[in-house]
């Protein structure tokens, strides 16, 4: 581990002395001196600082721009930033969630493996043998082919990854 520095945790070194850092939610107004303590002031409305700090300006809360498909997931405080998420049917383009894009739909032949959230896109997977999807959808999984046997029917047309099997009546062979 690094050896300790001349000032303790939650302190900073300035002009040969250790001054207290400002607590989260407050900004630095003036450094301490030999005769005075560090002077801090609370961040204003729509501002925050999330660490012990010596910042002279608070950071502005993130703006969740509805024109970019964003909405507020969690309102910011003096100690935390606003958290944005996307409107229903949309998801963030990055971890910082600065803009949104429409959830992707899975094409015919593909089904939804994982439904999209506000922060992640739809995950599609190809329909395996025995399954199909005949629609473009952001919700539908691959469906299993109809089992003709359980309906006392026979396969008249084989299924594909995009189409279900077609069942038909069994040929009645006369003795």
């Amino acid at each position: 581990p690094e050896p300790p520095t001349a000032c303790r945790e939650k302190q900073y070194l300035i002009n040969s002395q250790c001054c207290s850092l400002c607590q989260p939610g407050q900004k630095l107004v003036s450094d301490c001196t030999e005769f005075t303590e560090t002077e801090c002031l609370p961040c204003g409305e729509s501002e925050f600082l999330d660490t012990w700090n010596r910042e002279t300006h608070c950071h502005q809360h993130k703006y969740c721009d509805p024109n970019l498909g964003l909405r507020v997931q969690q309102k910011g405080t003096s100690e935390t930033d606003t958290i944005c998420t996307c409107e229903e049917g949309w998801h963030c383009t990055s971890e910082a969630c600065e803009s949104c894009v429409l959830h992707r739909s899975c094409s015919p032949g593909f089904g939804v493996k994982q439904i999209a959230t506000g922060v992640s896109d739809t995950i599609c997977e190809p329909c395996p043998v025995g399954f199909f999807s005949n629609v473009s959808s952001a919700f539908e999984k691959c469906h299993p082919w109809t089992s003709c046997e359980t309906k006392d029917l026979v396969v008249q047309q084989a299924g594909t990854n995009k189409t279900d099997v077609v069942c038909g009546p069994q040929d009645r062979l006369r003795a």
Partner: antibody
């Protein structure tokens, strides 16, 4: 009154080490940082590092990392600077000073001469 | 590292003169600027801290001013005992750095 008293001049061989002491009096030793400064003959002042005597925490000028080691003994109100692997470049006057809004009180300086 | 520049390395003045010594930092140091006096015998004293705060026991003929990156030390009525080298030092950002010094001599 505040006083900062340093150890006497040293004549040392190249490759060896030297330890300079700095005894403080007239104030609470653990309440103020101790700063160390180098001055080569006819030259300016160069900051070496700082120590907090309360718990021994230090900050060094990158240039002096591995060259200078700062320590402090609370019981005797004395700070120390050890200089290792001495060369002619280390020949200088070394000052200690009490911190607290600038280098508020200085020692008289310790002349270290490195010579074969 | 913050560079401290004292453009005048030596200065001649007469007793009773008003003398100004300047010091410039390579960036804003937020008034964390100190002035030191080094006498010919090598002893060093703090004169002024935080740009303008006179250290205890320092005569009131010494004063300091400045902000941002530009600072100055003024001796309003030069006396014989003021013959010394004067150094500025920034205490805003590690590593602490000093100006090269201004040597004050009597004309």
């Amino acid at each position: 009154q505040v006083q900062v008293q340093q150890s006497g001049a040293e004549l040392v061989r190249p490759g060896t080490s030297v330890k300079v002491s700095c005894k403080a009096s007239g104030y609470a030793f653990t309440n103020y940082l101790i700063e160390w400064v180098k001055q080569r003959p006819g030259q300016g002042l160069e900051w070496i590092g700082v120590i907090n005597p309360e718990f021994g925490g230090t900050n060094y000028n990158e240039k002096f990392k591995g060259k200078a080691t700062l320590t402090a003994d609370k019981s005797s109100s004395t700070a120390y600077m050890q200089l290792s692997s001495l060369t002619s470049e280390d020949s200088a006057v070394y000052f200690c000073a009490r911190g607290g809004g600038g280098f508020t009180y200085w020692g008289q300086g310790t002349l270290v001469t490195v010579s074969a | 590292h913050i560079q401290m520049t004292q453009t005048t390395s030596s200065l001649s003045a007469s007793l009773g003169d008003r003398v100004t010594i300047s010091c410039r930092a390579s960036q804003d140091i937020s008034s964390h600027l100190n002035w030191y006096q080094q006498k010919p015998d090598g002893t060093v004293k703090l004169l002024i801290s935080y740009t303008s705060r006179l250290h205890s026991g320092v005569p009131s003929r010494f004063s300091g001013s400045g902000s941002g990156a530009d600072y100055s030390l003024t001796i309003s009525n030069l006396e014989q005992e003021d013959i010394a080298t004067y150094f500025c030092q920034q205490g805003n950002t590690l590593p602490w750095t000093f100006g090269g010094g201004t040597k004050l001599e009597i004309k």
